[in-house]
Amino acid sequence: LIIGFGISGKHFITVTTFTSAGNIGEDGTLSCTFEPDIKLNGIVIQWLKEGIKGLVHEFKEGKDDLSQQHEMFRGRTAVFADQVVVGNASLRLKNVQLTDAGTYTCYIRTSKGKGNANLEYKTGAFSMPEINVDYNASSESLRCEAPRWFPQPTVAWASQVDQGANFSEVSNTSFELNSENVTMKVVSVLYNVTINNTYSCMIENDIAKATGDIKVTDSEVKRRSQLQLLNSG
């Protein structure tokens, strides 16, 4: 969470940004809020990126002005025009690229003053893991798969019954490059599992952490997955 202040005359404009992460190949949002001016025609929103000449996006007089937009963002940006009235200056970024990572500035000008705040935008790939019982293995095994990760993550297994146990000796993890030659498919197999136990497959890089849980009993298999972005405000 980053709060920036600006001053014009004696009026401060508070602009708030949230560090966020983009999943490459998908659409992302760079979050920015401010106290909205009721005079919408007086609101100017500018998004800038460190090291880039020209603007990422500009919105003024109630509409986009892309005359100074840098070519790397052409056709990929939009503000939530109907939400500017409630102080949402967030930027929608289509088809996130690895090169979109960096420091962005959300700059706001209203009829009373101006202000800005920076945000750190990380890019990578992250996805939910799915755990299945691997019936092809010679012994009872669990197979944890996640289709897209970048940078290469670490993978660890845990179990509810054997808390604190080190499963690195009884697991095998591989990373398979996907067709676009950036992201990788993560596959980890855990051997010698026992029934009536809950196992967790944890995948983590510097952008995200994902966990897949599986509970295997005589009568059923229960699964749960969750994904958490790291260092997000």
Epitope: H11, E35, P36, D37, I38, K39, L40, N41, G42, E61, G62, K63, A81, D82, Q83, V85, V86, G87, T110, S111, K112
Partner: antibody, heavy 116, light 107 residues
Framework: EVQLLESGGGLVQPGGSLRLSCAAS????????MHWVRQAPGKGLEWVAS????????YYADSVKGRFTISRDNSKNTLYLQMNSLRAEDTAVYYC?????????WGQGTTVTVSS | DIQMTQSPSSLSASVGDRVTITCRAS??????LNWYQQKPGKAPKLLIY???NLQSGVPSRFSGSGSGTDFTLTISSLQPEDFATYYC?????????FGQGTKLEIK
């Protein structure tokens, strides 16, 4: 339930004063701008005043500028309209409304009658 | 000030009819236009915000279109509960201004 409830209306003589209140409930009042809108008997809607979430921006219609004051107390979830030097043409139902993408929540209105 | 002009001022229609109400701004207001419905003795109700977005809970027979200076509210198939007065409102700048209203009556 999201709700706005106006109070403070009544009969007042020309030149007199009234203070209208609007009590908000069911939402985070401090996150929203607010409006006062009025409607004279048999007439259309007329915007009166607006205040932003933290009172940083305040605007008035020319017809009430210098006579009416909009304010809010976020700790009490309440919006106010102080009306001084009232005139016959201020007679109307006064509504408070939440400023979102449109005036999306309205109170039931309170009637102000200015007459001698 | 931005003037908002609605037409027609009144309109008679039957249940099941398709009805269109227009609103014209005296200068460009981008897409910052809302539509409200008001029934006698009641507070207005937001139908459409930002020219074309249906407010939550509003039936899909209501739709809005337009940008710049010319806007339209359409009711695809009138229902008995739709007979009311409709207002457009610009929120591009202050003073916020409403149209004079369109009274929709049963034929």
């Amino acid at each position: 339930e999201v709700q706005l409830l106006e109070s403070g209306g009544g009969l007042v003589q020309p030149g007199g004063s009234l203070r209208l209140s609007c009590a908000a409930s069911g939402f985070t009042f401090s996150s929203y701008g607010m409006h006062w809108v009025r409607q004279a008997p048999g007439k259309g809607l007329e915007w009166v005043a607006s205040i932003s979430s933290s009172s940083g921006y305040i605007y008035y219609a020319d017809s009430v500028k210098g006579r009416f004051t909009i304010s809010r107390d976020n700790s009490k979830n309440t919006l106010y309209l102080q009306m001084n030097s009232l005139r016959a043409e201020d007679t109307a139902v006064y509504y408070c409304a939440r400023a979102s993408s449109g005036m999306d929540v309205w109170g039931q209105g309170t009637t102000v009658t200015v007459s001698s | 000030d931005i003037q908002m002009t609605q037409s027609p001022s009144s309109l008679s229609a039957s249940v099941g009819d398709r009805v269109t109400i227009t609103c014209r701004a005296s200068q460009s207001i981008s897409s910052y236009l809302n539509w409200y419905q008001q029934k006698p003795g009641k507070a207005p109700k937001l139908l459409i915000y930002a020219a074309s977005n249906l407010q939550s809970g509003v039936p899909s027979r209501f739709s809005g279109s337009g940008s710049g200076t010319d806007f339209t509210l359409t009711i695809s198939s009138l229902q008995p509960e739709d007979f009311a007065t409709y207002y457009c409102q610009q929120y591009y700048t202050t003073p916020l201004t409403f149209g004079q209203g369109t009274k929709l009556e049963i034929k």
